[in-house]
C-alpha cells in the first residue's frame, strides 16, 4: 500500500492502490549537495549522475572508519525520496549529486559555497530546463551562505532545505533562515510537528511549510535492493523538493516567487498542532503541510498571497521592524503585531525602489513586527496614499483617487505613544471601498493598485468587547489582501493574515474590564482577478 | 592523526612584490565587516572566506587574495589561498591565522570576512 | 551510444567453470549495476543476479547463490560472470544488461556444457 | 515454472489490437511500480519495449503501452504489424530480486 508520506501530499484524485501522478517532474533536474550516494542502487538508478564534485573535512576521530553504506546512506535515502522509482515523490525526475557532506554527515559552509558555485556554472555552460537545489543540511546563521543562495535564487534556480532538526528558530540557521530559499520543516502521520531524540524540527518565521519528514521509508545503502525508514527535516524538504520538480515540470515558466506562492496555496492549512511550538512562535510559524497541486496545471488564474513576518523589531522606544516581499511579488498590505499591545503602528514605504512593510514599536512596549501581504499580480501599478494626521477634524481619510486604482490595504501609523487613551483609529474603508478612515492623531495610508480585472471588496466581522482573537475570512474565490482592526485601541495587539482569513488579536479584557466601545473588528479586503480568471479560461 | 601541518605542505612563502606597493587603499567611509558562527562548536577559525564588493572582477579576487599573502608574509605568516570564488559571489578562501583578520579587512574590494563553520546533514 | 560487449561462446565440461565478460561504454558507469541473465535453448529468461560498478556489491538469486562469482573491473569498464560446477543444465545464452532495469543488453555469449 | 505468468501464445491479425497479461503476486507485481515488457526475435537479445509499468523507452513505437490493475500488468500492442511477431516477456522487481515471465508467443495472422 502507498507509504503515509505520499499519500500525505497527494490530492485526493490520484489517491489509488499507489501513487502515480501525471507528469513526474522529467523536465527538471534536482541538485542534491549532500554525502556520496550508492547511485545504482534499484530505486535510484539511472536516475542520479553523480558529479565529480566532492568537497568534504575529514572524519573526526582517529579510529574512524569509513564504511560506504554508512556514508553513502544520507544522500542515497533522499535521493530515493525526491526521485526513487516506488517510494520518491518526482518519479521522472532526473538529479545530480555534489558530494559537501563527509561519512559522518559533516561539511563546511565553504564546501558548500564551492558547491552552490560549481552549480551555478554548470548552468551557465550548458543550460537545462528548471533546476532545484536541494540542500538537506544545516550550519548556524551565515550571511555568505545566504548570500550565496540569493544569488543562485536570483539566476532562476529554486532552492529548497532542510529547518534544522533542533528545536529551535530556524532563522538562527543557514541556509534556512536565506529568505529567497524554500525552507521546510517535518511533520508526521499525525500532523504533529516531528520530535528527533530531545530535540526536533525547528519551527518560526524562517519556516515556508512543512512537510513529511518522520518515518519516511526510501532507498538504503545497506544494499541494492534495501529501504528503509529515516527521519528529519532533510526528509522534508526531499518531499518538497520533488513536489516543485512536478510543479516546475508541469508549468516551466514559473518564476521561485510563482512556486513559493503555489506551494503555500496548495498545501493542507491548520492541521499541525501549534501546541508543540514555543508560545512566542505560534504565530509566525506556518501552519502548512506540502501538497501536490489537484491538477498538473496549477491555477493560473488565482490571485495568489502570502504573509511575510518581520524579525522582531526589539524593545527599544524607536524600534522598527520591516517585512519585504520577494522582487517580483507586491506588497499589498502591511499591519503590526505587538505581544505587549504597545505599538505606534506601521506604515508602507518605498526602500530601494520597493515598498516594504515598516513596524514602529512603542515607548514600554516590548517590541513589534511588521507583516507583509505579498502578492503575485501581474502588470499592477502600485501606490500608497498617505495622509497625515488630521488633528482637528473626525479622522484622517485616504482614498484612491486614480481612475481604475482599488484599495488592498490600510496601514496606519501614530507618533503618540498611547492611541487607547485618545479617539481610537479606524480603519474603516465601510460604505467607501477606496478609502481608508483613521484616527485623526495617525497618519493613515492606504495601498492602492490598478491592475487588469482587479476588484477588491471589504468584509467585517465584529465582536461586542475584546475576546482575544476575531476573525474575518475572504470567501471561496477571493483572496485576502488586506487585514486591519477596528478600532485600534490599545486593547488590539495587532492584525495579520493567515491564509485567506484576516486575525485580530487583542489582550483578554476580562482582567481589565472593557466597555461595548471598545467593540473589536477585524476588516479583511478580499481582492481577486477577473483577468487571470479570464486567461486561464481561454487557455482551456 | 595525520600531521596537523601536511595542509601548508602547499603554503607560498609570499615575498613582497612590486605588485603589493601598487594596490588601491580601501575605499573611504566602508568598513568591512567580520563575521562568525554564534554556536562556538561549529566555529573553523583559521579558514575565512573573504567576500569582496558585488562588481569586483575576477582579476581583482586574485589580486586582493595575492595582496594578502604578501602583506601576511612580511609579517612572516603563511597563508594558503584554498578557492577563488567567482560566479556567484565575488572572493576567496584563505587559511590563515586569525591573527591576520584585521589586515585582511582593510583590503581593498572587501565587504566582509567570515570564518568558515560546520553544517550537518539533518 | 551505450553499449554492453560480452566475450565469445564458450564450450565447457560438467563441474568446470566458465567466466563471461561483459565491457560497458556509452554511460556513467557508476550510475547502474549490470545484471545477468541466462536463456536456456527455447526457454524463458531467468535472472541470475546483479553487481555494483559503484562498488562491487553484488546480489546473486537464489538459484545459483554459492555457484556464481560477479566481478568488476572499472579500470577497463568490464564486468565477469563466473558460474563454477557447471551441468547440463547450464547450457544456455547468458547475457548482461545494464542495471535492474535492463535497458541495455549485451548481444549474449553461448554457453554449452557437455562431456 | 515461472514467478509471473503469463498466456503461452496469443495471435492477432494485422491492424489489430492484443493484450498479453502477465500475473504476479502483491509481492512483485501489486507490490511495484516497476513492470517491464521485452520483446524477443529469435537468436537476437532482449529488447525494452515498456518500463515501470506504462513508459516507453525512446524509438519503442507507441503502438506499444503498458498498464497493471492490482497484482496483473498487461501489454498492449495495437494496429498490429508483421514485425511485431516475436516473444515477449515481463519482469518485476521483488523484494531482493527480479522475476520474469514465462513469456508469450505472439503470431501475426
Known amino acids: 500500500s502507498i507509504p503515509w508520506n505520499l499519500e500525505r501530499i497527494t490530492p485526493p484524485r490520484y489517491r489509488a492502490d499507489e501513487y502515480q501522478p501525471p507528469d513526474g517532474g522529467s523536465l527538471v533536474e534536482v541538485y542534491l549537495l549532500d554525502t556520496s550516494i550508492q547511485s545504482d542502487h534499484r530505486e535510484i538508478e539511472g536516475r542520479v549522475m553523480v558529479t565529480d564534485f566532492e568537497n568534504v573535512p575529514e572524519e573526526d576521530g582517529t579510529r574512524f572508519h569509513r564504511q560506504a553504506s554508512k556514508c553513502d546512506s544520507h544522500g542515497t535515502h533522499l535521493a530515493g525520496v525526491v526521485s526513487g522509482r516506488d517510494a520518491g515523490v518526482a518519479k521522472g525526475a532526473s538529479m545530480r549529486s555534489l558530494r559537501v557532506l563527509n561519512c559522518q554527515g559533516k561539511g563546511t559552509v565553504s564546501g558548500t559555497l564551492i558547491g552552490l558555485e560549481f552549480i551555478r556554472k554548470s548552468q551557465l555552460v550548458q543550460p537545462v530546463g528548471p533546476l532545484v537545489v536541494l540542500l538537506p543540511l544545516a550550519g548556524g546563521y551565515s550571511r555568505v551562505l545566504n548570500a550565496a543562495c540569493q544569488r543562485l535564487a536570483r539566476a532562476g534556480v529554486v532552492l529548497v532545505t532542510a529547518a534544522g532538526n533542533f528545536r529551535d528558530d530556524a532563522c538562527l540557521y543557514s541556509p534556512a533562515s536565506a529568505p529567497e530559499v524554500i525552507t521546510v520543516g517535518a511533520t508526521n502521520a499525525q500532523d504533529q510537528p516531528v520530535t528527533l531524540g530531545t530535540l526536533g524540527t525547528n519551527f518560526g518565521r524562517c519556516v515556508d511549510l512543512f512537510a513529511p519528514g518522520e518515518d519516511i521509508i526510501g532507498a538504503s545503502s545497506d544494499c541494492s535492493t534495501c529501504f528503509v525508514s529515516q527521519s528529519g527535516t532533510s526528509q522534508a524538504a526531499a518531499h518538497v523538493a520533488g513536489i516543485a520538480a512536478m510543479m516546475l515540470s508541469a508549468e516551466p515558466e514559473l518564476t521561485l516567487a510563482e512556486l513559493r506562492q503555489r506551494l503555500i496555496h496548495f498545501s493542507a492549512k491548520d492541521v499541525i498542532n501549534e501546541a508543540w511550538f514555543p508560545e512566542d512562535q505560534r504565530v509566525l510559524t506556518p501552519n502548512l503541510v506540502a501538497a501536490l497541486p489537484p491538477s498538473t496545471h496549477g491555477a493560473g488564474w488565482q490571485l495568489f498571497c502570502r504573509t511575510v513576518w518581520s524579525a522582531h523589531s526589539g524593545p527599544t522606544r524607536m524600534a522598527t521592524a520591516i517585512a519585504r516581499c520577494a522582487p517580483d511579488e507586491e506588497l499589498l498590505s502591511c499591519s503590526s503585531f505587538s505581544r505587549s499591545g504597545k505599538r505606534r503602528g506601521e506604515r508602507m514605504e518605498a526602500q530601494g525602489g520597493k515598498l516594504v512593510c515598516r513596524a514602529h514599536n512603542a515607548f514600554g512596549g516590548e517590541g513589534v513586527y511588521a507583516i507583509a501581504r505579498c502578492c503575485l499580480l501581474p502588470q499592477a501599478n502600485c501606490s500608497v496614499h498617505t495622509a497625515p494626521p488630521a488633528e482637528a477634524s473626525m479622522g484622517t481619510r485616504v482614498h484612491c483617487h486614480q481612475q481604475g486604482h482599488v484599495l488592498t490595504g490600510c496601514s496606519s501609523h501614530w507618533e503618540v505613544e498611547d492611541l487607547g487613551t485618545h479617539k481610537p483609529p479606524v480603519l474603516r474603508p465601510r460604505g467607501q471601498p477606496n478609502q481608508c478612515v483613521g484616527h485623526r492623531e495617525a497618519s493613515i495610508h492606504a495601498s492602492c493598485c490598478h491592475a487588469p480585472g482587479l476588484e477588491c471588496k471589504v468584509k467585517e466581522h465584529g465582536i461586542p468587547a475584546p475576546q482575544g482573537q476575531v476573525t474575518v475570512a475572504c470567501e471561496e474565490g477571493w483572496t485576502l489582501t488586506g487585514c486591519s482592526a477596528l478600532p485600534g485601541t490599545s486593547h488590539v495587539l495587532g492584525a495579520y493574515a493567515v491564509d485567506n482569513t484576516c486575525v485580530v488579536r487583542s489582550r483578554d479584557v476580562s482582567t481589565t474590564g472593557s466597555t461595548s466601545e471598545e467593540a473589536v473588528t477585524a476588516v479583511a479586503i478580499c481582492c481577486r482577478s477577473r483577468h487571470l480568471a479570464q486567461a486561464s479560461q481561454e487557455l482551456q | 592523526q595525520e600531521d596537523e601541518d601536511g595542509d601548508y605542505e602547499e603554503l607560498v612563502l609570499a615575498l613582497r612584490s612590486e605588485e603589493d606597493g601598487l594596490a588601491e587603499a580601501p575605499e573611504h567611509g566602508t568598513t568591512a565587516t567580520f563575521h562568525r558562527c554564534a554556536k562556538d562548536p561549529w566555529r573553523l577559525p583559521g579558514t575565512y572566506v573573504v567576500v569582496l564588493k558585488e562588481e569586483t572582477h575576477l582579476s581583482q579576487s586574485e589580486r586582493t587574495a595575492r595582496r594578502l599573502q604578501a602583506q601576511a608574509a612580511r609579517r612572516g605568516y603563511l597563508t594558503k589561498i584554498l578557492h577563488v570564488f567567482h560566479g556567484l559571489l565575488p572572493g576567496f578562501l584563505v587559511k590563515m591565522s586569525g591573527d591576520l583578520l584585521e589586515l585582511a579587512l582593510k583590503l581593498p574590494h572587501v565587504d566582509y570576512i567570515e570564518e568558515d563553520s560546520s553544517v550537518f546533514a539533518q | 551510444q551505450v553499449q554492453l560487449v560480452q566475450s565469445g561462446a564458450e564450450v565447457k565440461k560438467p563441474g568446470a567453470s566458465v567466466k563471461v565478460s561483459c565491457k560497458a561504454s556509452?554511460?556513467?558507469?557508476?550510475?547502474?549495476?549490470i545484471s545477468w541473465v541466462r536463456q536456456a535453448p527455447g526457454q524463458g529468461l531467468e535472472w541470475m543476479g546483479w553487481i555494483s560498478a559503484y562498488n562491487g556489491n553484488t546480489n546473486y538469486a537464489q538459484k545459483v547463490q554459492g555457484r556464481v562469482t560477479m566481478t568488476t573491473d572499472t579500470s577497463t569498464s568490464t564486468v565477469y560472470m563466473e558460474l563454477r560446477s557447471l551441468r547440463s543444465d547450464d547450457t544456455a545464452v547468458y547475457y548482461c544488461?545494464?542495471?535492474?532495469?535492463?535497458?541495455?543488453w549485451g548481444q549474449g555469449t553461448t554457453v554449452t556444457v557437455s562431456s | 515454472q515461472s514467478a509471473l505468468t503469463q498466456p503461452a501464445s496469443v495471435s492477432g491479425s494485422p491492424g489489430q489490437s492484443i493484450t498479453i497479461s502477465c500475473t504476479g503476486t502483491?509481492?512483485?507485481?501489486?507490490?511495484?511500480?516497476?513492470v517491464s515488457w521485452y520483446q524477443q526475435h529469435p537468436g537476437k537479445p532482449p529488447k525494452l519495449m515498456i518500463y515501470?509499468?506504462?513508459n516507453r523507452p525512446s524509438g519503442v513505437s507507441n503502438r506499444f503501452s503498458g498498464s497493471k490493475s492490482g497484482n496483473t500488468a498487461s501489454l498492449t500492442i495495437s494496429g498490429l504489424q508483421a514485425e511485431d511477431e516475436a516473444d515477449y516477456f515481463c519482469s518485476s522487481y521483488t523484494s531482493t530480486s527480479m522475476v520474469f515471465g514465462g513469456g508469450t508467443k505472439l503470431t501475426v495472422l
Open positions: 556509452g554511460y556513467p558507469l557508476t550510475s547502474y549495476g
Open positions: 544488461a545494464r542495471g535492474y532495469g535492463m535497458d541495455v
Open positions: 502483491s509481492s512483485d507485481v501489486g507490490g511495484y511500480n516497476s
Open positions: 515501470e509499468v506504462s
